[in-house]
């Protein structure tokens, strides 16, 4: 009886350069004769419908048709046939399948492969064109993929045990395409400052699939002026 | 890191007055708004008040008004809480609690104050 | 004064579980509305903020919904360590107000 076990979930999901292991485990009744089994991996792409081979392995031949592909034969010994794929690309998302075929048992199992990139984000302030007691904050979002994205404004008063959400005098432009298939976004809040507390902490909040937790970057409105903080992206302590 | 430190646990009579402290560290004590809590086992939590950092203003909750006095000694950075004329109500856990130089609120770990005869 | 309910003062649940804390306000809100959660012997900790937001380091077995008058807090899968309670509290308006608390217990 020969069975193939792949990532539970069915998806796999992977930063965006990484050394990728896509897993595939063999379950066999008698001990694994590597001399007698051929595995070969094939993927799919997410935009055509054509099964390309990637890497196949049978006997003592072994084969990469993706630079740098490759299944570990000690790890196959002992059932592990997953495949390792350096320096993963956006465009090398899509179906991953390991077909085992020994003896005369044949079995197969397939899995989605998620590439995403996460994104680094910046503060600017540009006082450039703007009235007397009014700045424009800049939050700048950029090299993610996919392109759904989502950035929030939160303000946290002296007084206030928590964030509150700000929603008016936020405009968020549109996601711009890189060369490298990522993507850009900047968020504007406008203040005016003669109407906020100093001492009020503003935060730029970016969530994105790729982001266990959202990335943060702060200012402090001063007596003075607003001050850009030391530390973007500051951890959210409670 | 924000610490607020209070005294474990104070033991007065009935119609006796006690002050309860809080001390602040790792944030710039002065910039901030300090709330104190109360909480008695079962009934939730109150809002007492609070008071401004630089010691120029102060809220509290209509309740809590003649009750509770909110001082602030920056040199220590330490935040005080008078409460006078004690009842076996008053007896609870008082937490201060902070905003602190980020997100979020900081707790004391609180002060039980028992009244008892 | 903003008035906090939360109707049920126990709750019964078990390891694995999902469940769903509520709170209502005796007026609108809009998404002030924070969630705490208290161990014994231990001081109130800020799960949720703004309705849904959760902080960092906190589980996303927690969520958090709802504005205006009706929220929730939903535990999903939950383990031993969530067996404790949990407060609402509105920060739309002082005096800070707060629920009178839901204990989770095992079931």
């Known amino acids: 009886d020969l069975k193939v076990e792949m990532m539970a979930g069915g998806t796999q999901i992977t930063p965006l350069n990484d050394n990728v292991t896509i897993f595939c485990n063999i379950f066999y009744s008698q001990p694994l004769n590597i001399a007698a089994a051929a595995i070969t991996w094939f993927w799919k792409s997410l935009t055509f419908d054509k099964e390309v081979k990637v890497f196949e392995f049978f006997g003592d031949h072994q084969e990469a048709f993706r630079p740098g592909a490759i299944v570990s034969p000690w790890r196959l010994k002992s059932g592990d046939a997953s495949l390792r794929l350096p320096g993963i690309q956006l465009e090398e998302a899509g179906e991953y399948r390991c077909e085992v075929v020994v003896a005369a048992a044949a079995a197969q199992g397939t899995v989605q492969l998620e590439v995403v990139a996460s994104p680094a984000s910046r503060l600017l302030l540009d006082q450039v064109g703007m009235k007397e007691n009014e700045d424009k904050y800049m939050c700048e979002s950029s090299g993610f993929y996919p392109e759904a994205i989502n950035i929030t404004w939160e303000k946290q008063t002296q007084k206030f045990p928590h964030p509150i959400e700000i929603s008016e005098d936020v405009i968020t432009g549109p996601t711009i395409k890189n060369m490298d298939g990522t993507f850009n976004v900047t968020s504007c809040l406008k203040l005016n400052s003669s109407q906020e507390d100093p001492g009020t902490v503003y935060q730029c909040v970016v969530r994105h699939a790729s982001l266990h937790t959202p990335l943060r970057s702060n200012f402090t409105l001063t007596a003075a002026r607003h001050s850009l903080s030391e530390t973007e992206k500051t951890d959210n302590f409670s | 890191q924000v610490q607020l430190q209070q005294p474990g646990s104070v033991l007065v009579r009935p119609g006796a007055s006690v002050r309860l402290s809080c001390k602040a560290s790792?944030?710039?004590?002065?910039?901030?708004?300090m709330n104190w809590m109360k909480q008695r086992p079962g009934q939730g939590l109150e809002w007492i008040g609070g008071?401004?950092?630089?010691?120029?203003?102060?809220d509290y909750n209509e309740k809590f008004k003649g009750k509770a006095t909110l001082t602030v000694d920056t040199s220590s950075s330490t935040t005080y809480m008078d409460l006078s004329s004690l009842t076996y109500e008053d007896s609870a856990v008082y937490y201060c609690?902070?905003?602190?130089?980020?997100?979020?609120?900081?707790w004391g770990q609180g002060t039980t104050l028992t009244v008892s005869s | 004064d903003i008035v906090m309910t939360q109707s049920q003062k126990f709750m019964s649940t078990s390891v694995g579980d999902r469940v769903s804390v509520t709170c209502k306000a005796s007026?609108?809100?809009?998404?002030?509305v924070a969630w705490y959660q208290q161990k014994p012997g231990q001081s109130p900790k800020a799960l949720i903020y703004?309705?849904?937001n959760r902080y960092d380091g906190v589980p996303d077995r927690f969520t958090g919904s709802g504005s205006g008058t009706d929220f929730t807090l939903t535990i999903t899968n939950v383990q031993s360590e969530d067996l404790t309670e949990y407060f609402c509290?509105?920060?739309?308006?002082?005096?800070?107000?707060f629920g009178a608390g839901t204990k989770l217990e095992l079931k």
């Open positions: 790792g944030y710039t004590f002065t910039n901030y708004w």
């Open positions: 703004s309705a849904s």
């Open positions: 008071i401004y950092l630089n010691g120029d203003s102060t």
């Open positions: 509290q509105q920060y739309i308006s002082y005096p800070l107000t």
């Open positions: 609690t902070t905003r602190g130089d980020y997100f979020g609120d900081f």
């Open positions: 007026q609108n809100v809009g998404k002030y």
